[in-house]
């Protein structure tokens, strides 16, 4: 199957790489603008320069283009705990990330929130915390994993998934109770 091309892609494919078709005259191929600049005026004729202007502060273009406006710089989402890793320049958007000992949870393809890495108290680190994944913990005996925290088996209710992991402890507790009543 051939992917469907939009009108702009169709027009661009007629010209060699790095050039685009003049919107008013399809016999003219104009040179695209470099990253960090945008199209102010199309080239007046073949072999003549395209009028490209540098992006203003707060905007950027990250690749060669024939955009009429630069793109607005992204802002890091403070309410998501994001911090600015590198600020926006004319040819690169803002880079946002998380603080040290935090990981990203992506709510959607391009929206992430920062969370603290689990410390595996009452357990051991099975897999270290990574940029996009929390620490994976293994719990010590007498503890079970709940929301990636090691919780004491004394907090295990029969209806929860922990019953298998905590079964010996639960039986011991019952045993102690039984022996105490005789």
């Amino acid at each position: 199957l051939v992917p469907h091309l939009g009108d702009r892609e169709k027009r661009d494919s007629v010209c060699p790489q790095g050039k685009y078709i003049h919107p008013q005259n399809n016999s003219i191929c104009c040179t695209k603008c470099h990253k960090g600049t945008y199209l102010y005026n199309d080239c007046p004729g073949p072999g003549q320069d395209t009028d490209c202007r540098e992006c203003e502060s707060g905007s950027f273009t990250a690749s060669e283009n024939h955009l009429r406006h630069c793109l607005s710089c992204s802002k890091c989402r403070k309410e998501m705990g994001q911090v600015e890793i590198s600020s926006c320049t004319v040819d690169r958007d803002t880079v946002c990330g998380c603080r040290k000992n935090q990981y990203r949870h992506y709510w959607s393809e391009n929206l992430f929130q920062c969370f603290n890495c689990s410390l595996c108290l009452n357990g051991t680190v099975h897999l270290s915390c990574q940029e996009k994944q929390n620490t994976v913990c293994t719990c010590h005996a007498g503890f079970f994993l709940r929301e990636n925290e090691c919780v004491s088996c004394s907090n295990c209710k029969k209806s929860l998934e922990c019953t298998k992991l905590c079964l010996p402890q639960i039986e011991n507790v019952k045993g102690t109770e039984d022996s105490g009543t005789t």
């Epitope: 709510w107 959607s108 393809e109 969370f115 929301e147």
Partner: nanobody, 122 residues
Framework: EVQLLESGGGLVQPGGSLRLSCAAS????????MFWVRQAPGKGLEWVSG????????YYADSVKGRFTISRDNSKNTLYLQMNSLRAEDTAVYYC???????????????WGQGTLVTVSS
């Protein structure tokens, strides 16, 4: 077929509490982030809260932080929203949703329920 069915809405006085539930079916509930979204009369959609598959990661809009609590029971395929200290401005239709798409900072969702109306009034 994905189905999300909200319940628990109603009329409540300011300062009161409500617990919304969302029964999910037609997909593997325990694998997905789940969300609560609301729409106040004459206003746009607002993402209220989100919870990760195992419940460790949660998100709350500033407007509900400290008052609302999202939770889930994967064994029952059910999502919850405990709403305390309700205010008149919380009056809205509340929707349960999955599969967020984020266009230019505005979240939208591929699947939602039919909604449950919460009215906060004296």
């Amino acid at each position: 077929e994905v189905q999300l069915l909200e319940s628990g809405g109603g009329l409540v006085q300011p300062g009161g509490s409500l617990r919304l539930s969302c029964a999910a079916s037609g997909f593997t509930f325990e694998r997905y982030d789940m969300f609560w979204v609301r729409q106040a009369p004459g206003k746009g959609l607002e993402w209220v809260s989100g919870i990760s598959p195992r419940g460790r990661e949660t998100y709350y809009a500033d407007s509900v932080k400290g008052r609302f609590t999202i939770s889930r029971d994967n064994s029952k395929n059910t999502l919850y929203l405990q709403m305390n200290s309700l205010r008149a401005e919380d009056t809205a239709v509340y929707y349960c949703a999955k599969d967020m798409i984020n266009y230019h900072g505005t979240p939208s969702f591929d699947y939602w329920g039919q909604g449950t109306l919460v009215t906060v009034s004296s």
